[in-house]
């Protein structure tokens, strides 16, 4: 069971993947502090040439939805959705192999970034994983 | 030096468009959010629709929403802002502005541009 | 939509006087309001961001606090050069709103 809040999100960095939908938020006024730490992230990958097309086109929706995780609503009490594995997986992996080493290596990037763990991520075909975000 | 430069005003008639442009030089053009904001004569300041080019997300005020659209050309640093169906309500300066996060202030203002909504 | 009320809609002072603008938002949005100046054919001046930081450059003279959703611009000496419209703004929730504007006018 989660202790935390469902409220519309309220941003604009993420607003094209997000739009006014209703996101997973841990307190109430968090959505101001997470939006400043996504805009100062997409500074330093929009300014880094270490980012490129086929990884961006995926990576950008995918940590909106990680950072914005949507409200699960078939759920009583407030919860958020996951990413799905399989594709956090194949963004690791194969679309952004060579970015996440990058990232990962990169202390700058990871004070301002939370990378999602695919391994915490329910397997694909669980039951938690049937209403995860797709990408 | 940072700059914002809005250009495209002029008299249109009432149900005609008009496409405003603010350019932008001084800083790293698609890290920021643009905004527009608007002055009716003598009247306040109104909020009217923002863009983050990074994403290029946008959001818009209820009372443009469905006939302005905002848009940005990150190869050119410039933000347009394109107004359909025009009403003598929207006669105002058009202001452009910049803010780092939407939820920090506008920090540099372009000069604005007037549109004024006439028959 | 959320509601900027801001009063007095226009104050009469004199230099030196020290002058209060207050702001109430309609709910809750945190510390996420601006203070803007505005001279008449200009464009409006950052001056105060969320709530209470002093935007660069801008006197010490000008202050901002929070108590709860009641939001006060604060002046503490007033100078010749601050005579002007002040506007607070929410940057909270769409759509980002401004308080009606207050004229700090010469006594």
């Known amino acids: 069971e989660e202790d935390g809040f469902c409220q519309p999100y309220r941003g604009i960095a993420c607003a094209r993947f997000i739009g006014n939908r209703t996101v997973y938020m841990e307190s109430l006024h968090m959505q101001g502090e997470i939006e400043n730490q996504i805009t100062a992230a997409f500074t330093m990958i929009g300014t880094s040439s270490h980012l490129s097309d086929k990884c961006s086109q995926f990576a950008i929706p995918s940590l909106c939805h990680y950072a914005f995780p949507y409200c699960d609503e078939t759920s009583s009490v407030p919860k958020p959705r996951d990413l799905c594995r399989d594709e956090c997986e194949i963004l690791e992996n194969v679309l952004c192999q060579t970015e996440y080493i990058f990232a990962r290596s990169n202390p700058m990037i990871l004070m301002r970034l939370k990378l999602p763990n695919c391994e915490d991520l329910p397997q694909p075909e669980s039951p938690e994983a049937a209403n995860c975000i797709r990408i | 030096e940072v700059q914002l430069v809005e250009s495209g005003g002029g008299l249109v008639q009432p149900g005609g468009s008009l496409r405003l442009s603010c350019a932008a030089s001084g800083f790293t053009f698609q890290s920021y959010v643009i905004h527009w904001v608007r002055q009716a004569p003598g009247k306040g300041l109104e909020w009217v629709a923002a863009?983050?080019?990074?994403?290029?997300?946008?959001i818009y005020a209820d009372s443009v929403k469905g006939r302005f659209t905002i848009s940005a050309d990150t190869s050119k640093n410039t933000a347009y802002l394109q107004m359909n169906s025009l009403r003598a309500e929207d006669t105002a300066v058009y202001y452009c502005?910049?803010?780092?996060?939407?939820?920090?202030?506008?920090?540099?203002w372009g000069q604005g541009t007037l549109v004024t909504v006439s028959s | 939509d959320i509601q900027m009320t801001q009063s007095p809609s226009s104050l009469s002072a004199s230099v030196g006087d020290r002058v209060t603008i207050t702001c109430r938002a309609s709910?809750?949005?945190?510390?996420?309001v601006a203070w803007y100046q505005q001279k008449p054919g200009k464009a409006p001046k950052l001056l105060i961001y969320s709530a209470s930081s002093l935007y660069s450059g801008v006197p010490s003279r000008f202050s901002g606090s929070r108590s709860g959703t009641d939001f006060t611009l604060t002046i503490s000496s007033l100078q010749p050069e601050d005579f002007a419209t002040y506007y607070c703004?929410?940057?909270?929730?769409?759509?980002?709103?401004f308080g009606q504007g207050t004229k700090v006018e010469i006594k």
């Open positions: 502005a910049r803010s780092w996060s939407v939820y920090l202030g506008m920090d540099y």
């Open positions: 703004q929410q940057s909270y929730d769409s759509p980002r709103t």
């Open positions: 863009i983050y080019p990074y994403s290029s997300s946008t």
């Open positions: 709910q809750s949005v945190s510390s996420a």
